[in-house]
Interface confidence: medium
Amino acid sequence: WELTILHTNDVHSRLEQTSEDSSKCVNASRCMGGVARLFTKVQSIRAEEPNVLLLDAGDQYQGTIWFTVYKGAEVAHFMNILGYDAMALGNHEFDNGVEGLIEPLLKEAKFPILSANIKAKGPLASQISGLYLPYKVLPVGDEVVGIVGYTSKETPFLSNPGTNLVFEDEITALQPEVDKLKTLNVNKIIALGHSGFEMDKLIAQKVRGVDVVVGGHSNTFLYTGNPPSKEVPAGKYPFIVTSDDGRKVPVVQAYAFGKYLGYLKIEFDERGNVISSHGNPILLNSSIPEDPSIKADINKWRIKLDNYSTQELGKTIVYLDGSSQSCRFRECNMGNLICDAMINNNLRHTDEMFWNHVSMCILNGGGIRSPIDERNNGTITWENLAAVLPFGGTFDLVQLKGSTLKKAFEHSVHRYGQSTGEFLQVGGIHVVYDLSRKPGDRVVKLDVLCTKCRVPSYDPLKMDEVYKVILPNFLANGGDGFQMIKDELLRHDSGDQDINVVSTYISKMKVIYPAVEGRIKFS
């Protein structure tokens, strides 16, 4: 019996087609992805093949103005039209709190939404009961397939699930649910979830009875053969894990942003053993036409976005200096504003010993592309922020050793004075440079804001200590020459859309007046 699994993950609000790098589509003939194109491909596969499942491994939420405006209603609407068979909860599905998940998505989705390792308690338990499930048994042709969900247990550090959801260890939570499916005589079981490729592989290895793992969170691109676009494969598709009980378990992921549609064919024998698996992600490029009716629907929904981008989010009573003459040479107040917004967006009081889990931000000055003038009645709009942060990136959470941070700050000024983009703006950090010293030895003082303290204060950076830092995904991926961050980071979790982080902060503060306050000094 053959099953075709179509899968997406980490779509992050890319409802419209995008450019090849998943930013705003400029040249339509070279654009990719989007729900209208996805619909065309899914429908053509459904027409050709008998047993097809369309699955999503989480993080539909967060990433473009679509989510900022529609807050998840757009996800439910278009996923319903696409006819998804199941979705796993990702960490970003909790970005607007549990209410922001329940109302727009859980109550509106016509497909099961899954996670076996999220347990509700207190007053939430009855409110959310039945709105998401640990597993679902789906009829496919003449057979049944069990889908069991999972979500990163780091979600409380990455999003806003509140205090009434407990995120358990994935493997511990999955095993009893898989065992239950086995007692129900379900002998074909897919683990669908959002914990990253390393955990996907562990689930394949450790959870008895799981036949296939469809994952997300790490934006992993797998491909067999010559890849069709810029993404470099992390391994073959499917990636085969030998389980502890000797079975071969295919693990798949489909990069991110709706650029690819994962396509996996699984052959089961009569006992439900997987005897073969093969496939590849399908690049959703312009050779696949956008479905005209879905495209028309998208255009109808778009109108509200265009109106939103000119509305006032808040006011500034000071000039927001985002000029390259400032932000690439010294502390600039636009850099301070953005870093403060980044930290504010990551306030998660998860432990009594810590006032917060993260206190530090770094931001490449070259990523700040425009100032905002306060003399326009102080008005700040989404449009203004899109000029400051035009690249459609995310502000991510990483864990780094102090020694790596020191290297990053040395890199920040290794060729100071040439107006290069690597000069770092900061939050929760005090740095002093001595430019008379040779490159690689210019950081003379580096103090960081404590987290394990009731009164935050600045302490000298410790080389062997592990620190959490918020930074643009561009830096986490080694951009602007920050290869040491990419090579030495100990953990990397993708965060929220950059503009959304700053716009939310401005809306919350209502009036802003960021200053240059001595975060970066030269001796």
């Epitope: 085969i240 000797g246 053993n273 997987v274």
Partner: antibody
């Protein structure tokens, strides 16, 4: 329906070489290894090796390394086995075989066999 | 390489008999064992894989069992069309066949 159609019988002289073909149909050719098996008259089966049509990668039983060379032509969905420096020991029926699935070498699909006779 | 040794080499049977063939591996092969049937002038046919799983369409009078080094193949009630040579095969490490057991009519 999966089918493997092999080329006809061969009578060859010692020292010569021969190329046996196996035309596959009814499945995604590139997704499954093609195996070759030797059966000498009245004897057991000997696995020769396999080729992965996707990338042309191959694996051989050490006994047949240097004796057999496996190739594929993806465009015609045909696998080939070339046998060189033939001796009477190489006289046998040669089968191409595809696994049930692509994980394990359980040969659910076999060609009809090609008889190779080496004789002066 | 792993050697698969079948017992017996020949078996004289009558219709209706219960027949058992064993195959011993020279080292553990987990349950990575298959059994094949070959009739004269035909290609082999897959009967059992994973030591005990019957292949699609194989009658339930054919069963297999075993794990590690000792494997058993049984025909519960022999029928005339079952007269053939039966081979065991392992693919735990590389791939080897046993020498075969020939079922003949008494």
């Amino acid at each position: 329906e999966v089918q493997l159609q092999q080329s006809g019988p061969e009578l060859v002289k010692p020292g010569a070489s021969v190329k046996v073909s196996c035309k596959a149909s009814g499945y995604a050719f590139a997704s499954y290894n093609m195996n070759w098996v030797k059966q000498s008259h009245g004897k057991s089966l000997d696995w020769i090796g396999y080729i992965d049509p996707y990338n042309g990668g191959s694996s051989y039983n050490l006994t047949f390394k240097g004796k057999a060379t496996l190739t594929v032509d993806k465009s015609s969905t045909t696998a080939y086995m070339h046998l060189n420096s033939l001796t009477s020991e190489d006289s046998a029926v040669y089968y191409c075989a595809r696994g049930y699935g692509n994980y394990k070498a359980w040969f659910a699909y076999w060609g009809q066999g090609t008889l190779v006779t080496v004789s002066a | 390489s792993i050697v698969m040794t079948p017992t017996p080499k020949f078996l004289l049977v009558s219709a209706g008999d219960r027949v058992t063939i064993t195959c011993k591996a020279s080292q553990s092969v987990s349950n990575d064992v298959a059994w094949y049937q070959q009739k004269p002038g035909q290609s082999p046919k897959l009967l059992i894989y994973y030591a005990s799983t019957r292949y699609t369409g194989v009658p339930d009078r054919f069963t297999g069992s075993g794990y590690g080094t000792d494997f058993t193949f049984t025909i519960s009630t022999v029928q005339a069309e079952d007269l053939a040579v039966y081979f065991c095969q392992q693919d735990y490490s590389s791939l080897t066949f046993g020498a075969g057991t020939k079922l003949e009519l008494k």
